[in-house]
């Protein structure tokens, strides 16, 4: 089967910092050595970048300053961190990854992984 | 809106070069891949090329290889298809497609005319 | 490369008729990868489904996607006069990208 697998947990619950982490695993048909990694949302029906990094296999994974995410990569495993999360930002996380090179490219797209993030309580002021 | 605007087709003789070109908008370029695909007169559907991202990786369908090149400049929004060695078989209408978040083409352009006659 | 054989060649229907389309793969192509687009007369082609079972932005409920592996089905519910044109399916999970070579629904 020409198709690249993507495995990534079904559900995360993210910190009280809204900090989310989790693994996403690709099955490559073949031998790359550059990787595209994007996180996708999807609400709805509607799906949006979250954020995207390229990266050199056996090189770590670099996002763009300015990012939420941040990523450490193993072998055909990713480690993926997503920062910065509000309730607001519940929803399905998608690891999309591609084998850009050398040729054939491939695609790969997970199942998702729940997000679900939980505003903290304010702490209440305390008389002391 | 998020739209794909082709040019550059027109008549050429066997043998010759012609440049096309797709200008897109309302969307973040340098964040999708776009494919040239074309159709020859009464024809289905033949991929040509694709362009990624940052522009460094490209693949073309082995019809067009070492004829064809594709590059794009994420500063104005446009891509380009370069054509030489112009075949008669290369007559068609030429689409630029966008690459969608999930990998399937879900915005084209109208497409531009491209016809190799002596 | 995956070669994809749509059938059949033409179809001639009514309105309101229901349109069953076929796309077969010369290998396993994961349902996430299958495409589906319409094309009229003089227009670029549509995406009407991806992911083999998923509705573009815009696409109504009467067309819907089906299966996996080999084998992949479009169906139009009950035929609108607007449906007649060419339908194609293709796949992006690999390259070189691959399109069928259509199958034409035409008004009987």
């Known amino acids: 089967c020409k198709a690249m697998h993507v495995a990534q947990p079904a559900v995360v619950l993210a910190s009280s910092r809204g900090i989310a982490s989790f693994v996403c695993e690709y099955a490559s048909p073949g031998k790359a050595t550059e990787v595209r990694v994007t996180v996708l949302r999807q609400a709805d029906s509607q799906v949006t970048e979250v954020c995207a990094a390229t990266y050199m296999m056996g090189n770590e994974l670099t996002f763009l300053d300015d990012s939420i995410c941040t990523g450490t990569s193993s072998g055909n495993q990713v480690n993926l961190t997503i920062q910065g999360l509000r309730a607001m930002d519940t929803g399905l996380y998608i690891c999309k990854v591609e084998l850009m090179y050398p040729p054939p490219y491939y695609l790969g797209i997970g199942n998702g992984t729940q997000i679900y993030v939980i505003d903290p309580e304010p702490c209440p002021d305390s008389d002391f | 809106q998020v739209q794909l605007v082709e040019s550059g087709g027109g008549v050429v003789q066997p043998g010759r070069s012609l440049r096309l070109s797709c200008a897109a908008s309302?969307?973040?370029?340098?964040?999708?891949?776009i494919h040239w695909v074309r159709q020859a007169p009464g024809k289905g559907l033949e991929w040509v090329a694709v362009?990624?991202?940052?522009?460094?990786?490209?693949y073309y369908a082995d019809s067009v290889k070492g004829r064809f090149t594709m590059s794009r400049d994420n500063s104005k929004n446009t891509l380009y298809l370069q054509m030489n060695s112009l075949r008669a078989e290369d007559t068609a209408v030429y689409f630029c497609?966008?690459?969608?978040?999930?990998?399937?083409?879900?915005?084209w352009g109208q497409g531009t005319t491209v016809t190799v006659s002596s | 490369e995956i070669v994809l054989t749509q059938s059949p060649g033409t179809l001639s229907l009514s309105p309101g008729e229901r349109a069953t389309l076929s796309c077969r793969a010369s290998?396993?192509?994961?349902?996430?990868?299958l495409a589906w687009y319409q094309q009229k007369p003089g227009q670029a082609p549509r995406l009407l489904i991806y992911?083999?079972?998923s509705r573009a932005t815009g696409i109504p409920d009467r067309f819907s996607g089906s299966g996996s592996g080999t084998d992949f089905t479009l169906t139009i519910s009950r035929l609108e006069p607007e449906d007649f044109a060419v339908y194609y399916c293709?796949?992006?999970?690999?390259?070189?990208?691959?399109f069928g070579q259509g199958t034409k629904v035409e008004i009987k």
């Open positions: 497609a966008r690459v969608g978040l999930l990998g399937a083409m879900d915005v």
């Open positions: 309302g969307f973040t370029f340098s964040s999708y891949g």
């Open positions: 362009i990624w991202y940052d522009g460094r990786n490209k």
């Open positions: 290998q396993s192509v994961s349902s996430s990868y």
């Open positions: 992911g083999a079972s």
């Open positions: 293709q796949q992006y999970g690999s390259s070189p990208w691959t």
